[in-house]
Interface confidence: low
């Protein structure tokens, strides 16, 4: 299985800078039924959410089982990354992206990330 998995390096600001920026985090292992609304509702309990996205199969429109979340506050991001998350009855991981560009995302996509996806995930 080879997925379209990379996420842009927003990362931390350069060393020596006083403020740490938040990053888009990848949420792995989402149940297929989880919507962006569900994600926003869940992660809002940790802090203000800037963005959520559930990645969907371009042909079928079904969830691919992973997504993204971004918070306003860096402290919220750290808190969320430090634990596993029970979302719609399934344990999910929320991690910092680390890679480069998508192998097979269409040109219009700017999302790039890497993550361990579920075994039964299809393209």
């Amino acid at each position: 299985m080879r997925g379209s998995h990379h996420h842009h390096h927003h990362g931390l600001v350069p060393r020596g800078s006083a403020v740490q920026k938040t990053s888009d985090l990848i949420v792995l292992g989402l149940p297929w039924k989880t919507t962006e609304q569900d994600l926003k509702e869940y992660f809002s309990t940790f802090g203000e959410v800037l963005m959520v996205q559930v990645k969907k199969d371009l042909k079928t429109g079904h969830s691919k089982g992973f997504g993204f979340v971004r918070f306003t506050e860096y402290e919220t991001q750290v808190k969320v990354m430090s634990q596993r998350h029970m979302i719609d009855g399934r344990w999910c991981d929320c991690k910092l992206p680390n890679s480069k560009q998508s192998q097979d995302e269409p040109l219009r996509s700017r999302k790039v990330f890497v993550g361990r996806c579920t075994e039964d995930m299809t393209e």
């Epitope: 299985m1 080879r2 997925g3 998995h5 990379h6 842009h8 390096h9 990362g11 931390l12 910092l96 680390n98 890679s99 480069k100 560009q101 998508s102 192998q103 097979d104 995302e105 040109l107 996509s109 700017r110 790039v112 890497v114 993550g115 361990r116 996806c117 995930m121």
Partner: antibody, heavy 123, light 111 residues
Framework: QVQLVQSGSELKKPGASVKVSCKAS????????MNWVRQAPGQGLEWMGW????????TYAQGFTGRFVFSLDTSVSTAYLQISSLKAEDTAVYYC????????????????WGQGTLVTVSS | QSVLTQPPSVSGAPGQRVTISCTGS?????????VHWYQQLPGTAPKLLIY???NRPSGVPDRFSGSKSGTSASLAITGLQAEDEADYYC???????????FGGGTKLTVL
């Protein structure tokens, strides 16, 4: 087959500029990021950064900002490395390498590599 | 000074088994980032040998194997052959640097 072919060796004087090309074939150029790696004489490999071949957005490693520029010409599936204000310490072999990753891996690897371009800076 | 530490050299006789270590920290290998290995034969470009800690690309003999544990990884070569004489590099990702990183390289000499 997937191949990266780089331009030939260059001998330059200090203060001059050089542009190294890396022509890709055998795959869709815009589907994979391109990395640049430096190897000074008798030394190890040093990652210089990468360029998103979808967007043209470059990311430079620490120590490779300012005089180093990554660029693309997607119409001919070619990535470029330009170094300006050359110094003797820029003498090295410069490699381009395609970025690879899959859904089960937590960091990208480089495959294949170009054959390398020796840039010699000497007065 | 490389972020990933490798022994500068290792050696072995033909037919023997050698291992090359790659030691990182909690911001790279210890953070869960995978380790990849490259072989650089004299005068040539590096070639991918192992990716994702232990996977061999097609065409790489099964004499080469990789493993990872904690903050370090290792490359094992069994049944050493004269053509294995080369420099070997490990590579991973470092979250504190937000960049790919290489080990300093290990020169393998076949006695």
């Amino acid at each position: 087959q997937v191949q990266l072919v780089q331009s030939g060796s260059e001998l330059k004087k200090p203060g001059a500029s050089v542009k190294v090309s890396c022509k890709a074939s055998g795959y869709t150029f815009t589907s994979y990021a391109m990395n640049w790696v430096r190897q000074a004489p008798g030394q190890g490999l040093e990652w210089m950064g990468w360029i998103n071949t979808n967007t043209g957005n470059p990311t430079y490693a620490q120590g490779f900002t300012g005089r180093f520029v990554f660029s693309l010409d997607t119409s001919v599936s070619t990535a470029y490395l330009q170094i300006s204000s050359l110094k003797a310490e820029d003498t090295a072999v410069y490699y381009c390498a395609r970025d690879r990753i899959d859904g089960s891996s937590w960091s990208s690897w480089f495959d294949p590599w170009g054959q390398g371009t020796l840039v010699t800076v000497s007065s | 000074q490389s972020v990933l530490t490798q022994p500068p050299s290792v050696s072995g006789a033909p037919g023997q088994r050698v291992t090359i270590s790659c030691t990182g920290s909690s911001s790279n290998i210890g953070a869960g980032y995978d380790v990849h290995w490259y072989q650089q034969l004299p005068g040539t470009a590096p070639k991918l040998l192992i990716y994702g800690n232990s996977n061999r690309p097609s065409g790489v003999p099964d004499r080469f194997s990789g493993s990872k544990s904690g903050t370090s990884a290792s490359l094992a070569i069994t049944g050493l052959q004269a053509e294995d004489e080369a420099d070997y590099y490990c590579q991973s990702f470092d979250s504190s640097l937000s960049s790919s990183v290489f080990g300093g390289g290990t020169k393998l000499t076949v006695l």
